[in-house]
């Protein structure tokens, strides 16, 4: 059969019935990530509480993520929520401390149980804060006399956190 | 109808700690952060720094080790310490509320006047 | 830190006449920009933020443009208590900082 003269349409481009069916860039503000679209969809604008982190080209979307004091939230970044302390967690009364025995090591995201460290046969190491997580040492076994001593891992190190920013009103 | 106050102790000395509270009504700091600006007499102005909702704070790396932000909820009240303080700290002191759309001050304060002299 | 320049730094206007601000970043902010309008001996007062979007109670002859690097202010018609300092303000990244401002005076 014939072939259809849009699939010669690259990226960036769409095929344009008003003009005979010829590859036509796609107009600013607008992209086509695959060959052969008929119309070129329009770009993501960052506003708001929303910042852009990759700027819209013809061929890919733009993408957003939150200005400062936001996190994203959602597929894409759809939507984004300010953030809490370390500790905490963001409910619909705003950011509350962790409850004993969980812990929030961000700025965003719930709060999570401490590990069980009986659950794996071993010791409580450092106890956990609301901040971190405890650390689980040797098995009770292991520190039995004449046991080979075990070094203590350290601490993970605590990866920064840059500012979180945002999009518009 | 959403209100900033700040009280502020007008003339301080030199290398001492400057301390601002803003008080807050029409809104709850636990849904809105709160920022603190300054204007020297006759000039721009600067920002100093930001506490969030859920308390967690960011400050103007040039005077980052000098201030501290920090927050009272159940009072509506905002605490500025701003230490070792020089002429140059002279200023109008604002606190303003951050929206929940951008990071931007939509309701600002009336401001205070700091003047640092011995 | 990003610079905001901001010109001119002062302009003189008569009532009725359309008044353009122009506020410069030094590296791309996207749209995050946001205008205020400040009055002597009062604090200052939001007008624009993202770069075009009118805080609520704003009147309609305030309206902003630009993205990236070069924003916009624009009064289209001046009216007696528009007589003020403007600020433009980029809030993509920290340190938030602001215009240097334009005073805004009558002829």
């Known amino acids: 059969g014939l072939q259809d003269p849009c699939s010669n349409c690259p990226a960036g481009t769409f095929c344009d019935n008003n003009r005979n069916q010829i590859c036509s860039p796609c107009p600013p503000n607008s992209f086509s990530s695959a060959g052969g679209q008929r119309t070129c969809d329009i770009c993501r604008q960052c506003k708001g509480v929303f910042r852009t982190r990759k700027e819209c080209s013809s061929t890919s979307n733009a993408e957003c993520d939150c200005t400062p004091g936001f996190h994203c939230l959602g597929a894409g970044c759809s939507m984004c929520e300010q953030d809490c302390k370390q500790g905490q967690e963001l409910t619909k009364k705003g950011c509350k401390d962790c409850c004993f025995g969980t812990f929030n090591d961000q700025k965003r995201g719930i709060c999570r149980p401490w590990t069980n460290c009986s659950l794996d046969g071993k010791s409580v190491l450092v106890n956990g804060t609301k901040e971190r997580d405890v650390v689980c040492g040797p098995s009770p076994a292991d520190l039995s006399p004449g046991a080979s001593s075990v070094t203590p891992p350290a601490p993970a190190r605590e990866p920064g956190h840059s500012p979180q920013d945002i999009e518009g009103r | 109808q959403v209100q900033l106050q700040e009280s502020g102790p007008g003339l301080v000395k030199p290398s001492e700690t400057l301390s601002i509270t803003c008080t807050v009504s029409?809104?709850?700091?636990?849904?809105?952060?709160v920022h603190w600006v300054r204007q020297p007499p006759g000039k721009g102005l600067e920002w100093l720094g930001v506490i969030w909702s859920g308390g967690s704070t960011d400050y103007n790396p040039s005077l980052k080790s000098r201030v501290t932000i920090s927050k009272d909820n159940s009072k509506n009240q905002v605490s500025f310490k701003l230490s070792s303080l020089t002429a140059a700290d002279t200023a109008i002191y604002y606190c303003?509320?951050?929206?929940?759309?951008?990071?931007?001050?939509?309701?600002w304060g009336q401001g205070t006047l700091v003047t640092v002299s011995s | 830190d990003i610079q905001m320049t901001q010109s001119p730094s002062s302009l003189s206007a008569s009532v009725g006449d359309r008044v353009t601000v122009t506020c410069r970043a030094s590296?791309?902010?996207?749209?995050?920009v946001a205008w205020y309008q400040q009055k002597p001996g009062k604090a200052p007062k939001a007008l624009i933020y993202s770069a075009s979007y009118r805080d609520s109670g704003v009147p309609s002859r305030f309206s902003g443009s630009g993205s990236g690097t070069d924003f916009t202010l624009t009064i289209s018609s001046v009216q007696p208590e528009d007589f003020a300092t403007y600020y433009c303000?980029?809030?993509?990244?920290?340190?938030?900082?602001f215009g240097g401002g334009t005073k805004l005076e009558i002829k």
């Open positions: 029409g809104f709850s700091l636990i849904s809105y952060g």
């Open positions: 303000q980029q809030y993509n990244s920290y340190p938030l900082t």
């Open positions: 590296q791309n902010v996207g749209t995050n």
């Open positions: 303003a509320r951050n929206p929940l759309t951008a990071t931007v001050m939509d309701y």
